[in-house]
Interface confidence: medium
């Protein structure tokens, strides 16, 4: 049993829409191979530390194997882009499953960037963060279209956005839909119209492909174009892609290298 897009991230009651300064936003520029090599050990230790993650991964892995087995018959797996591995598919399925995983993961992502130490010692989703980030990069590079209009409904809160012109980030991995009507149905509290350039379609890797899901990474920046807060119905916020901004880069690999010799701990 799994979730429906565009309502994945449940923020607290009334949240400011800003640059999400505490969000962990690593893009892993220049350390993809090192991170991939570190995954087996890291994943094992995170499974031990995080039951929700271990259970969610196991469920997603079963689903992935099933889809692989039946993919040729039912066409349930899309052609993967170069570099796309099984673990990317499992990570996307784990994120989209209707389990507590996506909720706990995104809550942790929003806080993990409070400090480098917080990420290194208290963030037990390093593997999932890396795999989702890399999967979106691979899927985006494989797509012919550049930017796209998507829609996102949020259940459970109204955002307190800065005025038009402000630069904001969404704070975590954000699920949206290519289908306006799908997002509108779920957007009982806040409805977003988003022009994204870094979001990637994950339709073929979601538990619910019919929702035409697009996943937006936490480091994409947007300009607030317009907002409205009607007394009845959802608040409406319209965002346009600006670019990307990260405070952190390759933090896990830097720390690993520090253990075996001199290192530079600055963030890029």
């Amino acid at each position: 049993q799994s979730y429906s897009i565009s309502q994945l991230d449940i923020f607290s009651q009334e949240t400011p829409l800003d640059m999400a300064p505490a969000s962990f936003d690593d893009q892993y520029a220049g350390c993809l191979a090192d991170m991939t090599a570190a995954l087996p050990d890291l994943n094992h230790s995170e499974f031990q530390a995080n039951k929700v993650y271990a259970d969610g991964w196991a469920q997603a892995n079963n689903q992935w194997q099933e889809r692989r087995a039946w993919g040729s018959v039912w066409g349930s797996l899309p052609p993967s882009p170069p570099g796309f591995r099984d673990e990317h598919g499992v990570a996307l399925l784990a994120y989209t499953a209707n389990s507590p995983l996506h909720k706990e993961f995104n809550a942790a992502v929003r806080e993990a960037g409070r400090s480098r130490a917080h990420y290194l010692h208290h963030f037990s989703f390093k593997t999932l963060h890396f795999l989702l980030t890399e999967a979106l990069q691979l899927l985006r590079s494989h797509r012919s279209r550049g930017c796209q209009q998507v829609y996102r409904g949020v259940h459970g809160l109204r955002f307190r956005p800065a005025g038009p012109g402000a630069t904001v980030r969404l704070g975590g991995f954000a699920s949206a839909s290519l289908k306006n009507v799908a997002a509108q149905q779920f957007g009982e509290d806040t409805f977003f119209g988003i022009w994204t350039c870094l979001g990637a379609p994950i339709r073929g890797y979601s538990f619910f492909p019919e929702e035409e899901e697009v996943l937006i990474p936490p480091f994409e920046t947007f300009q607030v174009i317009n907002t409205s807060r009607p007394t009845q119905g959802p608040a409406r916020i319209y965002l346009r892609a600006l670019g990307k901004r990260s405070t952190y880069n390759c933090e896990y690999i830097k720390e690993k290298k520090c253990r075996s010799g001199p290192c530079w701990l600055g963030s890029s």
């Epitope: 049993q1 799994s2 979730y3 429906s4 449940i10 209707n98 507590p100 259940h155 459970g156």
Partner: antibody, heavy 122, light 106 residues
Framework: QVTLKESGPVLVKPTETLTLTCTVS??????????VSWIRQPPGKALEWLAH???????SYSTSLKSRLTISKDTSKSQVVLTMTNMDPVDTATYYC??????????????WGQGTLVTVSS | DIQLTQSPSFLSASVGDRVTITCRAS?????MHWYQQKPGTSPKRLIY???KLASGVPSRFSGSGSGTEYTLTISSLQPEDFATYYC?????????FGQGTKLEIK
Amino acid sequence: QVTLKESGPVLVKPTETLTLTCTVSGFSLSNARMGVSWIRQPPGKALEWLAHIFSNDEKSYSTSLKSRLTISKDTSKSQVVLTMTNMDPVDTATYYCARIYGGDSWGYFDNWGQGTLVTVSS
Amino acid sequence: DIQLTQSPSFLSASVGDRVTITCRASSSVSYMHWYQQKPGTSPKRLIYDTSKLASGVPSRFSGSGSGTEYTLTISSLQPEDFATYYCQQWSSNPPTFGQGTKLEIK
């Protein structure tokens, strides 16, 4: 606007089967991250969860009442139906349907119907 | 099944009082949700995911806790707050409710 409305008999006789219908609007029963539960409340007592159903037809029932309950849905009619066999006077209660936001093991009930009082008496 | 035990079952308080209701679970749960029910009406979602206020709920309500002990706090009671409050978990099937706490005017 999300609404749920229960309908069914107000009076049933002991040993009879109760059939309750929940008609929903403002959301679709095909929404994969929402479901519908039936919950009851005997007069002056606490809430008791009975059953739920999700868009993929996944169902779950109260352990103690499992053998007597059946839940089903008709997405095109936006209806969820609960049947409860072998009714007894202790089953007298207000029966609510409620929308589940979330999923198995992490959901909650974010919208409730007004409830329908069912009395079991001969 | 996870049992939820609320304390107290009955509580008399005055307008302006600070009130705390506790919900204890027989096993550890990840989240607790709270509902308010007034006589003759259906329950209304008050707090979800332990500490998040439902839409339209006044900020005098707050929730906290972890593991097996959770609390609902009303910082300054208002006349409209006199009702019955229920906690609910769904960390494991089946979802269960507490027995309720009836909050009455002193």
